[in-house]
Interface confidence: medium
Amino acid sequence: GYFPLSHPMTVAGPVGGSLSVQCRYEKEHRTLNKFWCRPPQILRCDKIVETKGSAGKRNGRVSIRDSPANLSFTVTLENLTEEDAGTYWCGVDTPWLRDFHDPIVEVEVSVFPAGTTTASSPQSSMGTSGPPTKLPVHTWPSVTRKDSPEPSPHPGSLFSNVR
């Protein structure tokens, strides 16, 4: 892949269920907008949801809420479908990348059939491809999973901005 992460974070949820990803950030990013996006191609990533201040935002089945006091923001994906599986970015709205995954972290979302038991193992995305001179990652996620017994009849799409 094109991300120099030794352990990209993976999170899994059941079809029809929901999952939440908590993305942490440094205090210098407290006042900036936070976003969640799905990169359609390398170096390009259209935002699905983005915070505006501390108010929560929703776009279809995806919501985002910033918690500046905790230096984290939470993205929740609801009524999961198999099409929701794939790579996403957790990011901070700044012009800068000090490293390609800062302040953006790659999150791999997996969706499994409802009723299947699987463990979601949150991994800290702090690796780099070479020996770091300074820990470059300033955003890191953790995950919680919420199971839902039945799939939603109207799953819809996770993102509206498709290029």
Partner: antibody, heavy 116, light 110 residues
Framework: EVQLLESGGGLVQPGGSLRLSCAAS????????MHWVRQAPGKGLEWVSA????????YYADSVKGRFTISRDNSKNTLYLQMNSLRAKDTAVYYC?????????WGQGTLVTVSS | QSVLTQPPSASGTPGQRVTISCTGT?????????VSWYQQLPGTAPKLLIY???QRPSGVPDRFSGSKSGTSASLAISGLRSEDEADYYC??????????FGGGTKLTVL
């Protein structure tokens, strides 16, 4: 096709003002940080300014701080650079570029000439 | 703000391997993993060749490769072709919310 198109360049006297525009198409403009980079005739590239996707964060090179203002109108898919108190050394081709600290899409540039 | 140091010129014959260096400081190149390289053909806008030290965007031939060690980065071009004749610039983020470019290297294919 992802495209950036600059306009607004021209001849201006020292001390004068000019506003450059950069029209974006082919991508969701509000999702991306934008930059202005300039290149004096026969010289190298110089980063000028940057703005975050939402427009909430702006940054400037020391050489233009206090004189230039970067802004964007996401409803019009347009990036701007307001240049005041222009000096002869500001003469350059000005490029707009898109990306998070690296520029993977560039416009063709617009020439600004500051001369009396 | 200063510029990253690049040799003003480099040259090679078709088929050769050429390397262009880019030297910064511990505040920019040495501290961050986002050295980018740009190619500027005569009369055109720059084009991204390498990002994040050694990653190639799609469409860039694998003849172009990047590396970084300490406060220096390098761009290597193998199997040199006449169409590679251009100016090459390195770039790095700095800790003071700014981008630095190198002075540029004019590559001549003999």
């Amino acid at each position: 096709e992802v495209q950036l198109l600059e306009s607004g360049g021209g001849l201006v006297q020292p001390g004068g003002s000019l506003r450059l525009s950069c029209a974006a198409s082919g991508f969701t403009f509000s999702s991306y940080a934008m930059h202005w980079v300039r290149q004096a005739p026969g010289k190298g590239l110089e980063w000028v300014s940057a703005i975050s996707g939402s427009g909430g964060s702006t940054y400037y090179a020391d050489s233009v701080k206090g004189r230039f203002t970067i802004s964007r109108d996401n409803s019009k898919n347009t990036l701007y650079l307001q240049m005041n108190s222009l000096r002869a050394k500001d003469t350059a081709v000005y490029y707009c570029a898109s990306g998070y600290g690296l520029m993977d899409v560039w416009g063709q540039g617009t020439l600004v000439t500051v001369s009396s | 703000q200063s510029v990253l140091t690049q040799p003003p010129s480099a040259s090679g014959t078709p088929g050769q391997r050429v390397t262009i260096s880019c030297t910064g400081t511990s505040s920019d190149v040495g501290n961050y993993n986002l050295v980018s390289w740009y190619q500027q053909l005569p009369g055109t806008a720059p084009k991204l060749l390498i990002y994040s030290n050694n990653q190639r965007p799609s469409g860039v031939p694998d003849r172009f490769s990047g590396s970084k060690s300490g406060t220096s980065a390098s761009l290597a071009i193998s199997g040199l072709r006449s169409e590679d004749e251009a100016d090459y610039y390195c770039s790095s983020y700095t800790g003071s919310n700014a981008l630095l470019f190198g002075g540029g290297t004019k590559l001549t294919v003999l």
